[in-house]
Each structure stands twice: as structure tokens, then as C-alpha cells.
């Protein structure tokens, strides 16, 4: 038969950061290829990554159409060299993915401190607003555009000369903090969606930036 000796995919896993979303699976193919289909709960199946020998498929273009929908994917296995034939009635082996809701489940990418500026005993720290591949009206949206006030940032800051950390929070991309005059400080930020109750609630910490280096500016 047309699908003999093909193995169903397994370990289907969603890998998603800032809505860039890839479905991965096993096994590495031996004499077989894969086609992926994706659908919302109420929608039709759409085929992607036709007859690929890869074990991953970039589904970003589909999920960014509505990041609040819940998606399901499935991976079909075909014999290598398979050509679609209209007469074939036998369904190839396939495996379903877990459900995936991008808005709730995409990981937050590592943030970047865009700049910091000191004026007297105040420092304004700005976090870069990352662009995503989510679109509305042919415009790409930033992370802040998508999440609005659901997204907060936590700032960790400390004197270069000590290890005691302080924290501040903002629901924008800017912090205004008090510092001691004449002291240099170091900064790191983390993106957080407080309403999430899962492991993907927080991003990794940004790279550390310290005063006295090129990102900063000081004015008396």
C-alpha cells in the first residue's frame, strides 16, 4: 500500500518566542517525508511544509492571523518520493500536536535595554519595544502593541560597587528611578506577563548594562 513502512510522527512540540512559532517533531525521517496541517478549533485545515524531510515547520504566518485563537496542528507521514495522487484513498499515518494559544503560550524573548539617561539623581531606563510578525492592516505590531498593559517589565539595578539589588516595575517601556549622586549603577530587565500562571510568565534577563558605558548619557 502507499503508506507502508511509514512511521507516525511523535513528540510534537511548539517552540514559540515573541510569536515566531515553529512546530517540531520526531523522528528524523528514513525513507519518508512529512506534511503539516494547522487549524483553529472552528476552521479548516491548511497544509504547510509539503513533503518535507525536515522535522520542523514554521507556522508563524498562520498563527499571527489571530494570536488569541487556539491552534491544533497535525503531521502526516508519507513514503519518500510520494506524489499526491487523486486515486489514493488510504489516509497516511499522522499525529496531532498539543493545542497552542499564542497569546497565552508564546515565550517572551530576552529584552534589550535601549538606553539610559541620568539627570541629577534620577535615571530614565528605556526598554526596546521588540517588533513581532503579528500584523494588523498590513502593519507589523510591536510586543507592546500586542500585549498592551498585560506586559510589564521588571528592572533590577545595583551599584557597581555592591551586590545588593533593587527592583522597579513598569507597565510601559520606561523606568524612572532614584539613584545616589556620583555612583555608577548596573541594570538588567525582565519581561513579565503577570496574568500568566505558567512557566512562560517571564523572559530571561536582558544583558546587563552599566553606567559609564556607551548606552548611557549623564547630565547634571
Amino acid at each position: 500500500s502507499g503508506t507502508t513502512n511509514t512511521v507516525a510522527a511523535y513528540n510534537l512540540t511548539w517552540k514559540s518566542t515573541n510569536f515566531k512559532t515553529i512546530l517540531e517533531w520526531e523522528p528524523k525521517p528514513i525513507n519518508q517525508v512529512y506534511t503539516v496541517q494547522i487549524s483553529t478549533k472552528s476552521g479548516d485545515w491548511k497544509s504547510k511544509c509539503f513533503y518535507t524531510a525536515d522535522t520542523e515547520c514554521d507556522l508563524t504566518d498562520e498563527i499571527v492571523k489571530d494570536v488569541k485563537q487556539t491552534y491544533l496542528a497535525r503531521v502526516f507521514s508519507y513514503p519518500a518520493g510520494h506524489v499526491e495522487s487523486t486515486g489514493s484513498t488510504e489516509e497516511p499515518p499522522y499525529e496531532n500536536s498539543p493545542e497552542f494559544t499564542p497569546y497565552l503560550e508564546t515565550n517572551l524573548g530576552q529584552p534589550t535595554i535601549q538606553s539610559f539617561e541620568q539627570v541629577g539623581t534620577k535615571v530614565n531606563v528605556t526598554v526596546q519595544d521588540e517588533w513581532t510578525l503579528v500584523r494588523r492592516n498590513d502593519t507589523f505590531l510591536s510586543l507592546r502593541d500586542v500585549f498592551g498593559k498585560d506586559l510589564i517589565y521588571t528592572l533590577y539595578y545595583w551599584k557597581s560597587s555592591s551586590s545588593g539589588k533593587k527592583t522597579a516595575k513598569t507597565n510601559t517601556n520606561e523606568f524612572l528611578i532614584d539613584v545616589d549622586k556620583g555612583e555608577n549603577y548596573c541594570f538588567s530587565v525582565q519581561a513579565v506577563i503577570p496574568s500568566r500562571r505558567t512557566a512562560n510568565r517571564k523572559s530571561t534577563d536582558s544583558p546587563v548594562e552599566c553606567m559609564g558605558h556607551e548606552k548611557g548619557e549623564s547630565r547634571e
Partner: antibody, heavy 120, light 111 residues
Framework: KQSVEESEGGLFKPTDTLTLTCTVS????????VSWVRQAPGNGLEWIGT???????YYASWANGRFTISNDNAPNTVSLQVNSLAAADTATYFC??????????????WGPGTLVTVSS | ELDLTQTASPVSAAVGGTVTINCQAS????????LSWYQQKPGQPPKLLIY???TLASGVPSRFSGSGFGTEFTLTISDVQCDDAATYYC???????????FGGGTKVVVE
């Protein structure tokens, strides 16, 4: 085509309760927010409140308590209820789609508006 | 109380000329840039022109442009047309969850 439309207003008496519905088509309320805005005759625009794409509601400080926005009646409708109507509530009421889905102030699709008159 | 103060009405503009309308917020708007501009003609609903301070809404002519950051914002109409006669409103979101506000409106008269 994406659109929003308010139900018909009309003439109401002081202390009456007003319920307006906003029917949306061509887009999902799970992805876009809806705001209610009113405009008294000859006056400017006044934001009443917003229901975001997660179903959370936000109100202007002056509207809190007497105004209620909800979307639990039907999948494509958002309701505005106003209790204890007064003459000062006489206005054209608009519903509009929030472009970002949260309470952003960017309202990209508006209904034609419906006139509500409160008079004894 | 949140306040958006706009250029006083009316503002006169000549066909082919340029008009600017200012909008000043009593505190920084949300993330310094979530401010929108609307055009409203009598008997019609408002129309979104600009969002996020400077992004042109779909279908709006490029004669309209927006700028600003924090508390000070400007709508500029260049090569003014007769059809631009209308009242223009700014609107903003604020960091406080519950707050969105409209400015008082600026009427533009085209001569």
C-alpha cells in the same frame, strides 16, 4: 467587510434604564476590543468605557457605577447599559472597534451612532 | 483627572496650505506614544487618521501626519483641501488601566 453598528436609541424618561447593543461583523471580539463613546449635541467626544479582547472592562471615572459594558449575550454583540438616565445623558452614542484589542484609544471602525434623548 | 488640551478653535487654513493642531496631555500618554487623531464631519462618526502618535491609518492620505512623544503631540495637514474642513480630536490611553480621554476638539475652516 468589517463593521460595527449600534442598536436604535430613542426617547427616554429620567430614571429610565437604557440598553444599547453594538453588533460587530467581519471580525472577532476575542481579538479586538470595543469602546463606547458619546457626543452631546454640539459638544465634543466623550469616552465612556471599553471592553477589551479578554473581556475586561474599563470605564471613565465619571461613568463608573452607572454604566455597564458587557458581551455575554451573543458572540458578536457588546452591550452598554446606563442606569438612572438624566437629561445630561442626551447624546449620540457610538460604538467603535479598538485597533489593538486593549484599551488603547485607537478606534479604527465606528458605527454611525444612535441618538438617545432623555426628557420628561 | 486626565486632560488633553487642543489648539483653540477655529483654525483657518488656505487651500494648498499647511495647518498644525497641537494636543497637550496633562501627563505622559501610555508608553509615551499611544495617542490617536480623529477627523469628524457634521452628522458623521469620527474617522481614525493617526494612531500611535505617527502611524497613518489605513486609507488616509499621506497629507496627514502626526508627531510627538510623552505629553506634546501635533497633527499636521499639508496641501490642505476643501474636504479637510472638519473638527479634529486627539485621544490617548494612559498608564492607569482605566483611563482613555479625548481632547476638546479643534475646528478647521478651509478658506
Amino acid at each position: 467587510k468589517q463593521s460595527v453598528e449600534e442598536s436604535e436609541g430613542g426617547l427616554f424618561k429620567p430614571t429610565d434604564t437604557l440598553t444599547l447593543t453594538c453588533t460587530v461583523s467581519g471580525f472577532s471580539l476575542s481579538y479586538y476590543g470595543v469602546s463606547w463613546v458619546r457626543q452631546a449635541p454640539g459638544n465634543g467626544l466623550e469616552w465612556i468605557g471599553t471592553i477589551d479582547s479578554s473581556g475586561r472592562t474599563y470605564y471613565a471615572s465619571w461613568a463608573n457605577g452607572r454604566f455597564t459594558i458587557s458581551n455575554d449575550n451573543a458572540p458578536n454583540t457588546v452591550s452598554l447599559q446606563v442606569n438612572s438616565l438624566a437629561a445630561a445623558d442626551t447624546a449620540t452614542y457610538f460604538c467603535a472597534r479598538d485597533f489593538y484589542g486593549w484599551n488603547s484609544g485607537a478606534l479604527d471602525i465606528w458605527g454611525p451612532g444612535t441618538l438617545v434623548t432623555v426628557s420628561s | 483627572e486626565l486632560d488633553l488640551t487642543q489648539t483653540a478653535s477655529p483654525v483657518s487654513a488656505a487651500v494648498g496650505g499647511t495647518v498644525t493642531i497641537n494636543c497637550q496631555a496633562s501627563q505622559s500618554v501610555y508608553s509615551n506614544k499611544y495617542l490617536s487623531w480623529y477627523q469628524q464631519k457634521p452628522g458623521q462618526p469620527p474617522k481614525l487618521l493617526i494612531y500611535k502618535a505617527s502611524t497613518l491609518a489605513s486609507g488616509v492620505p499621506s497629507r496627514f501626519s502626526g508627531s510627538g512623544f510623552g505629553t506634546e503631540f501635533t497633527l499636521t495637514i499639508s496641501d490642505v483641501q476643501c474636504d479637510d474642513a472638519a473638527t479634529y480630536y486627539c485621544a490617548a490611553a494612559y498608564s492607569d488601566d482605566s483611563d482613555t480621554a479625548f481632547g476638546g476638539g479643534t475646528k478647521v475652516v478651509v478658506e
